[in-house]
């Protein structure tokens, strides 16, 4: 089958890193600078991605593979193949359209990216709060009160009151 295909289509013989040049009687020509072909039999080479500005080159473009980018310090990759670079925030913050904002009371973010998430509700698992949550850290749930003092009520103490004007997101 391969032999039959190559007799019918001379372009199928062109390996990765080359293209089938219609202007030169369909001979295999090397990809020009700043371009690549990752598969054989291509009639054109693809333009290499340029990792410029906020992007940094993680892997140079070659005749057979595209460049790969990551982000300059202070930014992190988003999307397939690091298609975008998003600004880092501090732990305890999230990125909004207005920039980095502190997590609202009752929420936390332990990373430089992503959104603030609500503290774990220990009482849902019948447990109590062992360590209070912060903007940067989730609460730590401990054994239920019943486990700590046999015969005692198993009601979890109420969660701390919310700050006025703040609610978890």
């Amino acid at each position: 089958f391969e032999r039959t295909r190559s007799l019918q289509d001379p372009c199928s013989n062109c390996p990765a890193g080359t293209f089938c040049d219609n202007n030169r009687n369909q001979i295999c020509s090397p990809c020009p600078p700043n371009s690549f072909s990752s598969a054989g039999g291509q009639r054109t080479c693809d333009i290499c991605r340029q990792c410029k500005g906020v992007f940094r080159t993680r892997k140079e473009c070659s005749s057979t593979s595209n460049a790969e980018c990551d982000c300059t310090p202070g930014f992190h990759c988003l999307g397939a193949g690091c298609s975008m670079c998003e600004q880092d925030c501090k732990q305890g913050q999230e990125l909004t359209k207005k920039g980095c904002k502190d997590c609202c009371f009752g929420t936390f973010n332990d990373q430089k990216r992503g959104i603030c998430r609500p503290w774990t509700n220990c009482s849902l698992d019948g447990k109590s709060v062992l360590v209070n949550g912060t903007k940067e850290r989730d609460v730590v749930c401990g054994p239920s009160p019943a486990d700590l003092s046999p015969g005692a009520s198993s009601v979890t103490p109420p969660a701390p009151a919310r700050e006025p004007g703040h609610s978890p997101q």
Partner: antibody, heavy 118, light 110 residues
Framework: QVQLQESGPGLVKPSETLSLTCTVS????????WSWIRQPPGKCLEWIGY???????NYNPSLKSRVTISVDTSKNQFSLKLSSVTAADTAVYYC????????????WGQGTTVTVSS | QSVLTQPPSASGTPGQRVTISCSGS????????VNWYQQFPGTAPKLLIY???QRPSGVPDRFSGSKSGTSASLAISGLQSEDEADYYC???????????FGCGTKLTVL
């Protein structure tokens, strides 16, 4: 399709700050670089600086001490401030959208003329 | 004084082929791709060629670009009167971490 529109005062006094805004319509500001380019009367195009949608900036070294570019993604706008202007800053100012993976300016605003004069 | 060097003017008669050159250095054209912009009087520049030789949709195939080493060129075949405009080359400069332009070539159709 995406359109850019520059706005701001057409006349600025020497030593004052030139302030221009570029409004992006018909598309998102995310994922692109956004540049300011200027062209003095009868002269060459000069790159002033760019901002990436997430806040990364870079400026032409010859103007760096006087330039600030900022972005407001909630309004789909980005802005230029050029301080301590002189007559040499008189030019047509263009805002552009720059492709972030192959770096070319595929969308240009119509341009706004700024004259520096007392 | 522009980083990329272009001839200030070029001319040709209708139907002719005209080439505009653009010379740079290893930090720009030598290591990055070249773009070309067309500008008519009183209007904003328009992207004509990107990534050395790619045409945006709507640009006639009479326009072609090429690059070799630290130089690039724009070729216009079958010259037409409506091609009379200023043509700018541009590209990324690694030492600047930003784009650089040529000072433009004024094309006159005789």
């Amino acid at each position: 399709q995406v359109q850019l529109q520059e706005s701001g005062p057409g006349l600025v006094k020497p030593s004052e700050t030139l302030s221009l805004t570029c409004t992006v319509s018909g598309g998102s500001i995310s994922g692109y670089y956004w540049s300011w380019i200027r062209q003095p009367p009868g002269k060459c195009l000069e790159w002033i600086g760019y901002i990436y949608y997430s806040g990364f900036t870079n400026y032409n070294p010859s103007l760096k001490s006087r330039v600030t570019i900022s972005v407001d993604t909630s309004k789909n706008q980005f802005s230029l401030k050029l301080s301590s202007v002189t007559a040499a800053d008189t030019a047509v100012y263009y805002c552009t959208r720059d492709h972030s993976h192959y770096y070319y300016m595929d969308v240009w605003g119509q341009g706004t003329t700024v004259t520096v004069s007392s | 004084q522009s980083v990329l060097t272009q001839p200030p003017s070029a001319s040709g008669t209708p139907g002719q082929r005209v080439t505009i050159s653009c010379s740079g250095s290893s930090s720009n054209i030598g290591s990055n791709t070249v773009n070309w912009y067309q500008q008519f009087p009183g209007t904003a520049p328009k992207l004509l060629i990107y990534s050395n030789n790619q045409r945006p949709s709507g640009v006639p195939d009479r326009f072609s670009g090429s690059k070799s080493g630290t130089s690039a060129s724009l070729a216009i075949s079958g010259l037409q009167s409506e091609d009379e405009a200023d043509y700018y080359c541009a590209g990324w400069d690694d030492s600047l971490n930003g784009p650089v332009f040529g000072c433009g070539t004024k094309l006159t159709v005789l």
